[in-house]
Amino acid sequence: NFMYSKTVKRLSKLREYQQYHPSLTCVMEGKDIEDWSCCPTPWTSFQSSCYFISTGMQSWTKSQKNCSVMGADLVVINTREEQDFIIQNLKRNSSYFLGLSDPGGRRHWQWVDQTPYNENVTFWHSGEPNNLDERCAIINFRSSEEWGWNDIHCHVPQKSICKMKKIYI
């Protein structure tokens, strides 16, 4: 009876995600067969989040919209470890929007999920950010410094990275 109600709950949760994520990849968390964590196929997973590299070229606003219709946001990078994971899936000759912007052009950077912007956990390329008209952040590769962040005009189409919390069923 307990197993039955658990299964019914799982099925209703899966139905919620079905519109945009017809297929989920789930792994068993820990030793308990009851707990599964899932990411949409073919998203990748790291710690408690799922990541998707969007290869369509869009402005920052539309990139965020694209993530939101999939139940995600543009990526918020919280640690060096998280960035190191993300860059494994990126192409060196491309740039990708992050969920970081400076809407007023006053160098008040803010993350899309309202995570406080912490200057100590940022990975700007040297000399960046450098232009008040460039109010959106990308991650890209520079041969001298490897992967880092750069500010760019928000209307210039780029690829992007979406992030969502893992789905627990």
Epitope: G56, M57, Q58, S59, T61, K62, K65, N66, V69, N131, D133, E134, I152, H153, H155, V156, P157
Partner: antibody
Framework: QVQLVQSGAEVKKPGASVKVSCKAS????????IHWVRQAPGQGLEWMGT????????SYNQKFKGRVTMTRDTSTSTVYMELSSLRSEDTAVYYC???????????WGQGTLVTVSS | DIQMTQSPSSLSASVGDRVTITCRAS??????LAWYQQKPGKAPKLLLY???TLAIGVPSRFSGSGSGTDYTLTISSLQPEDFATYYC?????????FGGGTKVEIK
């Protein structure tokens, strides 16, 4: 007032290159991105790509990749679109257009007719 | 790439007529759609953006509607200066493709 003034008509031979200019005035040149759109005689409109005059960042329509190059000169508030390896199908009016704050083309140049003929 | 299919390709109408032009996208463009008017030998002029927002200086007889993949431009009462070619364009992702155009001619 905002103005985009383009260079004059050009006649080119197949295989040659053409460079069309678009001089902006009436606004801060480096604050708005510029797009290029072309229109073959009696045909519809075709998006070619965009350039950000501040940093020089570009994004091109894959159809033209390798043949189109967009550049800018901030000292003269001018954007350039160069198309190489011209063929007769490239005969068209080439327009530059400014993308406004709302992310649509709010101002257009008057157009530059490029004729490719042997 | 998202394709834009505009219909009809041409239509004949009289002054005072109500005119409707449709544009269908091959994928969801989330209302990121513009409508332009173009007269012979001139550059296109922005009429509406975000599917239904009137551009500055555009008469209120022009209106737009739609969502997802299907969008409409309506001219409530056609005026002599409205005889022109109309284009839709999406701005969801590059390439920002245009519809094939609708030529509005005098009946």
């Amino acid at each position: 007032q905002v103005q985009l003034v383009q260079s004059g008509a050009e006649v080119k031979k197949p295989g040659a290159s053409v460079k069309v200019s678009c001089k902006a005035s009436g606004y801060t040149f480096t604050s708005y991105i510029i797009h290029w759109v072309r229109q073959a005689p009696g045909q519809g409109l075709e998006w070619m790509g965009t350039i950000y005059p501040g940093g020089g960042d570009t994004s091109y329509n894959q159809k033209f990749k390798g043949r189109v190059t967009m550049t800018r000169d901030t000292s003269t508030s001018t954007v350039y679109m160069e198309l190489s390896s011209l063929r007769s199908e490239d005969t068209a009016v080439y327009y530059c257009a400014r993308m406004g704050d709302n992310e649509y083309f709010d101002y257009w140049g008057q157009g530059t007719l490029v004729t490719v003929s042997s | 790439d998202i394709q834009m299919t505009q219909s009809p390709s041409s239509l004949s109408a009289s002054v005072g007529d109500r005119v409707t032009i449709t544009c269908r996208a091959s994928g969801n463009i989330h209302n990121y759609l513009a409508w332009y008017q173009q007269k012979p030998g001139k550059a296109p002029k922005l009429l509406l953006y975000d599917a239904e927002t009137l551009a500055i200086g555009v008469p209120s007889r022009f209106s737009g509607s739609g969502s997802g993949t299907d969008y409409t431009l309506t001219i409530s009462s056609l005026q002599p200066e409205d005889f022109a070619t109309y284009y839709c364009q999406h701005f969801w992702s590059t390439p920002y493709t245009f519809g094939g155009g609708t030529k509005v001619e005098i009946k």
